[in-house]
């Protein structure tokens, strides 16, 4: 009897009520491997979840998060809210970045502005909650008589903190 069941392909189940006949999975269910005695119920993507891939007889539905949220966990099991640029997500919701920090993304944490003086440079453009400072030439380069042939150094890409 076991051998009969092992012949049932994905998308079917081995129906004990019908002498081990391979029956197609009912609507809204699937079997991703052969030889299964039951089909699994399809995942439903509703509420904050939206369907990325429809369920078929051989594979489960795949969900994504609706606009304003992003996926967390295995197979997008959870949806976490996005924040605006200039904010960070805390345990109590989205909070504005403190002065001296910025976040140019909808997720992640606020990071300190680049300290231009550590590289011997000056601040060319002030930082905001949404943007890092832009470092320019060193103060010495801007003094009278200094050569202006050297273009300003590009802004340093800030290091990304872990989520």
């Amino acid at each position: 009897l076991q051998d009969l069941c092992s012949n049932c392909p994905a998308g079917t189940f081995c129906d004990n009520n019908r002498s081990q006949i391979c029956s197609p999975c009912p609507p809204n269910s699937f079997s991703s491997a052969g030889g299964q005695r039951t089909c699994d119920i399809c995942r439903q993507c509703k509420g904050v979840f939206k369907t990325r891939k429809e369920c078929s007889s051989t594979s489960n539905a795949e969900c994504d998060c609706i606009s304003g949220y992003h996926c967390l966990g295995a197979e997008c099991s959870m949806c976490e809210q996005d924040c605006k640029q200039g904010q960070e997500l805390t345990k109590k919701g989205c909070k504005d970045c403190c002065f001296g920090t910025f976040n140019d993304q909808k997720r992640g944490i606020c990071r300190p502005w680049t300290n231009c003086s550590l590289d011997g440079k000056s601040v060319l453009v002030n930082g905001t909650k949404e943007r890092d400072v832009v470092c320019g030439p060193s103060p010495a380069d801007l003094s009278p008589g200094a050569s202006s042939a050297t273009p300003p150094a590009p802004a340093r890409e800030p290091g990304h903190s872990p989520q």
Partner: nanobody, 124 residues
Framework: EVQLLESGGGLVQPGGSLRLSCAAS????????MTWVRQPPGKGLEWVSS????????YYADSVKGRFTISRDNSKNTLYLQMNSLRAEDTAVYYC?????????????????WGQGTTVTVSS
């Protein structure tokens, strides 16, 4: 491999109680803070409560303060959430999560591992 396995969810009437458990393996449990979060139907994640690695510091969302109690048994590598005076709005999938350090707060998320979740339904 780091694993978190929640249990204890179920159907309960308003005003009732449930105790959720989270069995941890694959890491030195007492070295890390732990957190409970939940996802109500059709909504995003909500932070519920956090506890430091030693168990000495606990934090709660305003919505559960005075009703829920987080605790841990480091000798059993298990995290708990005792939920009393349950309300319909507590209906959610509850996830246990490991934080990245031993300390925690009610501010930053510092979660690096999630469990699979256990469903709590509060209904009459």
């Amino acid at each position: 491999e780091v694993q978190l396995l929640e249990s204890g969810g179920g159907l309960v009437q308003p005003g009732g109680s449930l105790r959720l458990s989270c069995a941890a393996s694959g890491f030195t449990f007492s070295n890390y803070a732990m957190t409970w979060v939940r996802q109500p139907p059709g909504k995003g994640l909500e932070w519920v409560s956090s506890i430091s690695g030693s168990g000495g510091s606990t934090y709660y969302a305003d919505s559960v303060k005075g009703r829920f109690t987080i605790s841990r048994d480091n000798s059993k590598n298990t995290l708990y959430l005792q939920m009393n005076s349950l309300r319909a709005e507590d209906t959610a999938v509850y996830y246990c999560a490991k934080e990245g350090t031993g300390t925690t707060s009610d501010y930053y998320y510092n979660v690096d591992v999630w469990g699979q979740g256990t469903t709590v339904t509060v209904s009459s």
